[in-house]
Each structure stands twice: as C-alpha cells, then as structure tokens.
Interface confidence: medium
C-alpha cells in the first residue's frame, strides 16, 4: 500500500479499482479521525501567492515551509515560502517539495527512498511497508491488464492517487487505501511534515484541492500544538 504520488500524481502505473468505501460529502468541518475525507496536501504551483506569516513549518501548506524571506533576514519575520524543487539547496526536509527530501543540503527525489509523497509517505513510514516489492514499479505491470482501463471511482481500492479518477486521491481507510474525495475549502485537513515522526493514521484524509493549502485556522493560533485545527484555505 504505498508509493510516491504527490507531485502531480507522478507515478502512472497502476493497480486496481474496486474495494473500499466512499466520501462523506456533508462533513465540512469534523475533526473525527475516521471521517472519510483523509488528508495532507498536494504539490501545487502557486500563482498570485500571498505571503502568509508563520512561526513554524506546521502553519504552512505542505507545499511550503516557514522561513525568513531574505537570506540572513530578521528571524522574527517569517512567512510561508514555496517549497524547493529537486536539486535546489535545502537545510531540512520541510524545505523540499513533496516527493523529495533534503540530503546533503540538496533536495533529492524520494522515489527510491523511504521519504515519499505526503500521503503515500505517511503510509510507507507509518505502516512499515517493506520496500522489497517497490523498488521496481514495473513488477506491478504483471497484474492483469483488465485492471487498467478505468480509473478508480470513490471507494475503489488503490495503491496511489494516479489509480483514482479526477477529484479523488488514494488515502488509507485502514484495511486498504481507497479513492476518496479531495478536500474542499473549509474542510478539516491533516498536516504532515516530512520529519519521519508521523502519527499512525488508520483513517486518512485526502489533500486539499487545487488553490487550497492545509493551514492552521486563524482563530486556533493560540491553541496548543496538539489541538490546533487545520482546514483547507485559499492561498
């Protein structure tokens, strides 16, 4: 149950449709961990980007990190900056875009590594999948070709988001990962940073839809770290 996906659902080879369950259209803001809307956040290109003040990476979208906008600038003035793409310089994993991690000061691809795209990475890290079956994605193509013509609908079992139809992502629903609806504005999302210390999400939310970032709700800034509520918000 794994594999990197978040960079535009990068990996295009696919197992099944069919299996799990579907979304819960009505539940815009529910912090219940098992709601059928699982999450994290998707890599997005950021146009008309509005600076968002922050104190730590957790307050930014998953495609962002928190830092001073100028090199050597005032540490007290920090904003959410766009994540760094492959081969760009970095100082920590959070600076690199999903699907990459910081190695020797450079953002490198996580495809051959246990840092994986945000949703997939949570599952790989947290659920201890062995990597022996993953090193060559081509082994999956031996599965019967009839599996491949239709994209998974809501509730279909999947291995990665590219298995799912548009508007859906591949997220854990305990027994397996299934295609679930991408989150809409105002819906509760789950923040993950690539720090290798994820909580185990048995029931996982999708990432926020296009133009949205998973950010801490403004009125929750004073709350303790553990009780902060993140929702999908416009850039």
């Amino acid at each position: 149950t794994l594999n990197s996906v978040l960079n535009s659902n990068a990996i295009k080879n696919l197992p099944p449709p069919l299996g799990g369950a579907a979304g819960h259209p009505g539940s815009a803001v529910s912090a219940a961990p098992g709601i059928l809307y699982p999450g994290g956040n998707k890599y997005q290109t950021i146009d008309n980007y509005q600076p968002y003040p922050c104190a730590e990476d957790e307050e930014c979208g998953t495609d962002e990190y928190c830092a001073s906008p100028t090199r050597g600038g005032d540490a007290g003035v920090q904003i959410c900056l766009a994540c760094r793409k492959r081969r760009k310089r970095c100082m920590r994993h959070a600076m690199c875009c999903p699907g990459n991690y910081c190695k020797n000061g450079i953002c490198v691809s996580s495809d051959q590594n246990h840092f994986r795209g945000e949703i997939e990475e949570t599952i790989t890290e947290s659920f201890g999948n062995d990597h022996s079956t993953l090193d060559g994605y081509s082994r999956r193509t031996t599965l019967s070709s009839k599996m491949y013509h239709t994209k998974g609908q809501e509730g279909s079992v999947c291995l990665r988001s590219s298995d799912c139809a548009s508007g859906l992502c591949c997220a854990r629903h305990f027994w397996s990962k299934i295609c679930k609806p991408v989150l809409k504005e105002g819906q509760v999302c789950t923040k993950h940073r690539r720090k290798g210390s994820h909580g185990l999400e048995i029931f996982q939310r999708c990432y926020c839809g296009e133009g949205l970032s998973c950010r801490i709700q403004k009125d929750h800034h004073q709350a303790s770290n553990s009780s902060r509520l993140h929702t999908c918000q416009r850039h």
Partner: antibody, heavy 112, light 111 residues
Framework: QVQLLQSAAEVKKPGESLKISCKGS????????LHWVRQAPGQGLEWMGW????????NYAQNFQGRVTMTRDTSISAAYMELSSLRSDDTAVYYC?????WGRGTTVTVSS | QSVLTQPPSASGAPGQRVTISCTGS?????????VHWYQQLPGAAPKLLIY???NRPSGVPDRFSGSKSGTSASLAITGLQAEDEADYYC???????????FGTGTKVTVL
Amino acid sequence: QVQLLQSAAEVKKPGESLKISCKGSGYDFPGYYLHWVRQAPGQGLEWMGWINANSGATNYAQNFQGRVTMTRDTSISAAYMELSSLRSDDTAVYYCTREDHWGRGTTVTVSS
Amino acid sequence: QSVLTQPPSASGAPGQRVTISCTGSSSNIGAGYDVHWYQQLPGAAPKLLIYGNSNRPSGVPDRFSGSKSGTSASLAITGLQAEDEADYYCQSYDSSLSGYVFGTGTKVTVL
C-alpha cells in the same frame, strides 16, 4: 466508545432468506463503511462485502454476488445484510465490522 | 479456498517464540497491499492484533510483532503466554478477486 450491536441468533430453513442488522454507536456512522464477514463452525473467516454507510454503495465478494444485499439506514445508524436462498452451508456466525472494531456476531443456523 | 495460506497449527512452551507465516501472491501481499493480523479467542469475535504489516494498536503487548517481505508476511509472538492460545488470521486485499481476503488461520497452542 465505538460499538457495533448485532441482532439476535436466527434459525432458518433451506431456501429461506435471512436479514440481520448491525447498529453502530459511539462514532459518526455515515463516515465509515461496514463490512460483513462470516465464519462457519470450525472454519476460517470469509469476507462477504462492504457497504458505504454514507452513500449506500456496495461491493460484494464474488462468492456472494446475486445472493447478498447490503443496505443501511443512516437515521438509526444501522446496516443490514440480507442473504437469500439459504443452504445448510450458510450456517455460520456473521460479523459486521468497521475494520478496526467488530460486532459480537450473529449466529445463524440453517437446518431443515 | 483462501488465497492466503497459513500453517494450520503452531505451538510452543510458555516463554518461547512462535512465528506464523502468511503466504500470498503477486495479486495480494506481493502487490503492496497491507497485511493485518487478528487474534480470535474461543467463542469471541476477532480482535485486531497488528495492522499495516507491523503496527500494534494500543493495548496490544509488544510481544506481538508483524513483518512483511515479498509475497508473504509473518506474525511473531515472543515470550508466549497461556492467554495467547487462540486462532490467528492474516488479512489483505486481492486485486484478482477485487476483494478482501483472510488467511486460512493458525491455531496456536501453549504447551
């Protein structure tokens, strides 16, 4: 806490239909989907299918297609599993499960 | 017939280590689908023991551990205790059947 309360034991004759219930409490019922799993006496576990408690969408195991119907009533947080054309080898304990939580099972005996 | 094969029985003296295998194929475990393990005490419903190949839910003793490699998975019980006497089932998803599957089950006896 999460609980799945199943209906009482039933005795049926071959050819009849069976409908058992599973009532969820302690969680957001429509937010999850429920599976039905059965276990014949002295045998292993057999997955029968699932129902999405929100939309009512279903997916049945190949062995049961055409004979099983899963429904739900969100107003009372209940799911139902109906099995038709019963045979003696349908004698089993039928469990509903939210995957991480299981009901205690409903014992069904099919005998003439 | 189950597509996940387990040994029918396993046994050990108290304090010993017992390992149960769960052998699948490229359409289930080998395809990357997670393996979960359940313990079923006599007359009771199955209880989740290990999920996502190697994770223990809270309340499950660390004597229980799971692993997965290739097309098979295994459950290890170290420091076997009398209360571990039960049936153990592995479970995964099978793409060729488009459904969830359970292993054949293993009865663990504490000698």
